[in-house]
C-alpha cells in the first residue's frame, strides 16, 4: 500500500501523491505488448499473455496503446521477418519490409510517424532469409494519445513473444 | 550520503528508504556489461572495465545478471558480427546468426526467451560482411531472476565495448 | 510549481530538491534530436522541430549533446540508409555503413565510442537497398560530457524525423 512503513510525513505525501517514485515502485505507466501468434496475416497486439503487461493506466484499444498521462515516454518496438526457400516466383525484385510506430493525437488529424525502420530483402538471391528491426526513442506525449504500428511485410513476420513486440514506459 | 542536506523528515525518509528517487541519484539498479574481447570463441560478460558497471544491487554470476529487487526493468543487448572474405570455393549456404536474452526464474524450470534477433548471412555472396543486432524491452522481473544471453555465431563477433553489450535498468 | 499541494515537509523538500521525481514530472534531463533533412551531405542534429526536444538542462552545442548533471543516462540513436538502383555495370565492391555515438569527456583527451553499429552493403548486387541501424545503452556520464555521433555513409541517409534520430535521458 502507498505509504506503508514510511515516516508520517512521507507516508502522507505518498498517499496524496501516490505516483511519487520509490525505486522499484510499480506506480509508473508502462506497457509491453506481443504480437498474437495465432493471427498469421495481421499484427494484433496482446497484453494478457506471456511476458506482456499493461501497468498504471496504459490500456490497449483498437490495437493502439492509449497514453494515460502527459509526459515523456520511451517507446519501442521490434519485428522479425523471415522467408522460406524459393518463396518468390517469377521475380528477383526485392521485398520491401518496414515497421513504424505512429502517433495519433488530438493535436493532429493524421498519424504521425515516430519511429520507422526499413529494409529491402532479395528472396530470389538469398533464401531462406531472416531480418530483425528494432527501434525506440523518447517522446513527449499527451494524455489520450494513441500509439500504434504499421508494418509492411506482415505475412513474413516471425510471431513469438521474444521477436515481435511493442512497448512504452514513462520516464 | 542519503539524506544529506534534506529537511529532517525527508532526511529520515531517505535514510529509511534509500531508494527514494532524487533525480540523477544513482540509487536505482542498473547494469551495463561488455563482451570480453580477450575471449574470442565465447561471449563472457564483463562489468569491471571500460564503460561497464553494476550498480545498486545488480551482480554478475555465471555470466548472468542477477536481478536485485522485483520490479519492471528495461533489458537490452547488442552484438555485431563480421566475416572475412572467403575462398572462391566458399559454400553459398547461409550462416545463421542469432542473439537472445533469456530469463531463468524460480517460477520456470527453463530459460525463457525475452528478446530474440536473427539473421541469415550469405558469406559466399557478400564478403567481407558486417551485421549488427540490437534489441531491448521492458519486463516484470522478480528478485533473484537471472538474465543471460545465448548467441549463434560467436566466432564472428566483433568484440569491443561499443559493439557487444548487455544491460538492464529498473524503471 | 515545485511543492504545490504537498504536505509542508514534502513541499520544503521539493523546493530544496526540485528534481525529486514525482511520476510524469518533466524534471528529468531528456533529449531527442532529429537529423536536419535540409542538409543532404551532413548529419546536423536539430532540437527545435517536429518531435525533437531538449529538457531540463540538456543543450545542443557544436552538434553535440551536453550532459547537464552527472548520473546514469540511457543514450540511443538510429539511422536509416538507402541506395538507388544502379546500372548493371555497377561495382560489386561493398559500401561501408556505420553509425557511432561517441563521448568526449574532460576525463579523456579523445572521443570514446559508446555505441557502434556497422554494415556492408553490396549495391551492384542488390538494388535498390535500404538498411536501418539502431542502438542504445546505459552509461555513467559526468556533467559537461559531450555526446556526439559519427556516421560513415552520410550521403545515403534517409533523413526524416522517424528514421534518423539521437537522444538520451537520465535514469
Amino acid at each position: 500500500l502507498p505509504g506503508v512503513g514510511l515516516t508520517p510525513s512521507a507516508a502522507q505525501t505518498a498517499r496524496q501523491h501516490p505516483k511519487m517514485h520509490l525505486a522499484h515502485s510499480t506506480l509508473k505507466p508502462a506497457a509491453h505488448l506481443i504480437g498474437d501468434p495465432s493471427k498469421q496475416n495481421s499484427l494484433l497486439w496482446r497484453a494478457n499473455t506471456d511476458r506482456a503487461f499493461l501497468q498504471d493506466g496504459f490500456s490497449l484499444s483498437n490495437n493502439s496503446l492509449l497514453v494515460p498521462t502527459s509526459g515523456i515516454y520511451f517507446v519501442y518496438s521490434q519485428v522479425v521477418f523471415s522467408g522460406k526457400a524459393y518463396s518468390p516466383k517469377a521475380t528477383s525484385s526485392p521485398l520491401y519490409l518496414a515497421h513504424e510506430v505512429q502517433l495519433f493525437s488530438s493535436q493532429y488529424p493524421f498519424h504521425v510517424p515516430l519511429l520507422s525502420s526499413q529494409k529491402m530483402v532479395y528472396p530470389g538471391l538469398q533464401e531462406p532469409w531472416l531480418h530483425s528491426m528494432y527501434h525506440g526513442a523518447a517522446f513527449q506525449l499527451t494524455q489520450g494519445d494513441q500509439l500504434s504500428t504499421h508494418t509492411d511485410g506482415i505475412p513474413h513476420l516471425v510471431l513469438s513473444p521474444s521477436t515481435v513486440f511493442f512497448g512504452a514506459f514513462a520516464l | 550520503l542519503p539524506g544529506v542536506g534534506l529537511t529532517p523528515s525527508a532526511a529520515q525518509t531517505a535514510r529509511q528508504h534509500p531508494k527514494m528517487h532524487l533525480a540523477h541519484s544513482t540509487l536505482k539498479p542498473a547494469a551495463h556489461l561488455i563482451g570480453d574481447p580477450s575471449k574470442q570463441n565465447s561471449l563472457l560478460w564483463r562489468a569491471n572495465t571500460d564503460r561497464a558497471f553494476l550498480q545498486d544491487g545488480f551482480s554478475l554470476s555465471n555470466n548472468s545478471l542477477l536481478v536485485p529487487t522485483s520490479g519492471i526493468y528495461f533489458v537490452y543487448s547488442q552484438v555485431v558480427f563480421s566475416g572475412k572474405a572467403y575462398s572462391p570455393k566458399a559454400t553459398s549456404s547461409p550462416l545463421y546468426l542469432a542473439h537472445e536474452v533469456q530469463l531463468f526464474s524460480s517460477q520456470y524450470p527453463f530459460h525463457v526467451p525475452l528478446l530474440s534477433s536473427q539473421k541469415m548471412v550469405y558469406p559466399g555472396l557478400q564478403e567481407p560482411w558486417l551485421h549488427s543486432m540490437y534489441h531491448g524491452a521492458a519486463f516484470q522481473l522478480t528478485q533473484g531472476d537471472q538474465l543471460s544471453t545465448h548467441t549463434d555465431g560467436i566466432p564472428h563477433l566483433v568484440l569491443s565495448p561499443s559493439t557487444v553489450f548487455f544491460g538492464a535498468f529498473a524503471l | 510549481l515545485p511543492g504545490v499541494g504537498l504536505t509542508p515537509s514534502a513541499a520544503q523538500t521539493a523546493r530544496q530538491h526540485p528534481k525529486m521525481h514525482l511520476a510524469h514530472s518533466t524534471l528529468k534531463p531528456a533529449a531527442h534530436l532529429i537529423g536536419d533533412p535540409s542538409k543532404q551531405n551532413s548529419l546536423l542534429w536539430r532540437a527545435n522541430t517536429d518531435r525533437a526536444f531538449l529538457q531540463d538542462g540538456f543543450s545542443l552545442s557544436n552538434n553535440s549533446l551536453l550532459v547537464p548533471t552527472s548520473g546514469i543516462y540511457f543514450v540511443y540513436s538510429q539511422v536509416v540508409f538507402s541506395g538507388k538502383a544502379y546500372s548493371p555495370k555497377a561495382t560489386s565492391s561493398p559500401l561501408y555503413l556505420a553509425h557511432e555515438v561517441q563521448l568526449f569527456s574532460s576525463q579523456y583527451p579523445f572521443h570514446v565510442p559508446l555505441l557502434s553499429s556497422q554494415k556492408m552493403v553490396y549495391p551492384g548486387l542488390q538494388e535498390p537497398w535500404l538498411h536501418s541501424m539502431y542502438h542504445g545503452a546505459a552509461f555513467q556520464l559526468t556533467q559537461g560530457d559531450q555526446l556526439s555521433t559519427h556516421t560513415d555513409g552520410i550521403p545515403h541517409l534517409v533523413l526524416s524525423p522517424s528514421t534518423v534520430f539521437f537522444g538520451a535521458f537520465a535514469l
Epitope: 517469377a90 526485392p94 526499413q118 509492411d152 511485410g153 | - | -
Partner: antibody, heavy 114, light 113 residues
Framework: EVQLVESGGGLVQPGGSLRLSCAAS????????IEWVRQAPGKGLEWVGE????????NYNEEFKGRATFSADNSKNTAYLQMNSLRAEDTAVYYC???????WGQGTLVTVSS | DIQMTQSPSSLSASVGDRVTITCKSS????????????LAWYQQKPGKAPKLLIY???TRDSGVPSRFSGSGSGTDFTLTISSLQPEDFATYYC?????????FGQGTKVEIK
C-alpha cells in the same frame, strides 16, 4: 481470392495522356512489386517497369522513361501507370502483375487514335 | 538488355504429342551463388492474360499439370509438354528476370495439326 484488376483503358488521342489503375485484393500489397507489361495487338509481351508500393521505389524500361510514371496508393491497395505523349504504337493491352506470387490482372485495352 | 530468342515461332501438333520449345538468352541467367536460373515460362490463350507455368527455370507453379516441365541452365532452356492436351493450344513465352529490363521471348504459338 487474390485478384489484380486493371482499369482506365480506352480511346485516347495521339499526344494525350492516360492513367491506368491496378487494384489488388486478397493479399498484402505494399511489400511486393507491381509490374506493368503491355502487349500490342498480335504481338508479344513487353515489360514497361515496376513499382514497390511500400517504398515507392521504381524500375523503368529505358524505352518508357520520361513517358511512363508509376505510383501507388497503399491505403487503396492500388498501383497506377501514367502514360504521357501517347502515340499510335502505344496501342496495346496493359497488364499489371505481381511476379512474387505469379498473379496477373486481366488487362485493359488502350487505343491511341485520332 | 538481355535478348531472349524462342524457337520455333510456331508449331503444329496433335493431342498426345510431346512438344518441346526452346529459349536462348544472350547472357547467362544462372546466378552462381545460389545456382538458380532466373527464367520463367508463361502460357497465354487468346484474349486472356498470361499464366505463369514455370519459374526458376524448372519449378512448376501450383496447379500446373505435371505434363509441363522446364529444364536448362545458363543460356539454354526448354519447356516440354509431355503429352499435349486440347487445352494446351496457346502461345508460350519465356521471360528472364535476371536483370533489368525484364525481357520476354517473341513467343511460340502451338496450334492444332
Amino acid at each position: 481470392e487474390v485478384q489484380l484488376v486493371e482499369s482506365g483503358g480506352g480511346l485516347v488521342q495521339p499526344g494525350g495522356s492516360l492513367r491506368l489503375s491496378c487494384a489488388a485484393s486478397g493479399y498484402t500489397f505494399s511489400s511486393y512489386w507491381i509490374e506493368w507489361v503491355r502487349q500490342a495487338p498480335g504481338k508479344g509481351l513487353e515489360w514497361v517497369g515496376e513499382i514497390s508500393p511500400g517504398s515507392a521505389s521504381t524500375n523503368y524500361n529505358e524505352e518508357f522513361k520520361g513517358r511512363a510514371t508509376f505510383s501507388a496508393d497503399n491505403s487503396k491497395n492500388t498501383a497506377y501507370l501514367q502514360m504521357n505523349s501517347l502515340r499510335a504504337e502505344d496501342t496495346a493491352v496493359y497488364y499489371c502483375a505481381d511476379g512474387y506470387h505469379g498473379y496477373w490482372g486481366q488487362g485493359t485495352l488502350v487505343t491511341v487514335s485520332s | 538488355d538481355i535478348q531472349m530468342t524462342q524457337s520455333p515461332s510456331s508449331l503444329s501438333a496433335s493431342v498426345g504429342d510431346r512438344v518441346t520449345i526452346t529459349c536462348k538468352s544472350s547472357q547467362s541467367l544462372l546466378y552462381s551463388t545460389n545456382q538458380k536460373n532466373f527464367l520463367a515460362w508463361y502460357q497465354q490463350k487468346p484474349g486472356k492474360a498470361p499464366k505463369l507455368l514455370i519459374y526458376w527455370a524448372s519449378t512448376r507453379d501450383s496447379g500446373v499439370p505435371s505434363r509441363f516441365s522446364g529444364s536448362g541452365s545458363g543460356t539454354d532452356f526448354t519447356l516440354t509438354i509431355s503429352s499435349l492436351q486440347p487445352e494446351d493450344f496457346a502461345t508460350y513465352y519465356c521471360q528472364q528476370y535476371y536483370s533489368y529490363p525484364r525481357t520476354f521471348g517473341q513467343g511460340t504459338k502451338v496450334e492444332i495439326k
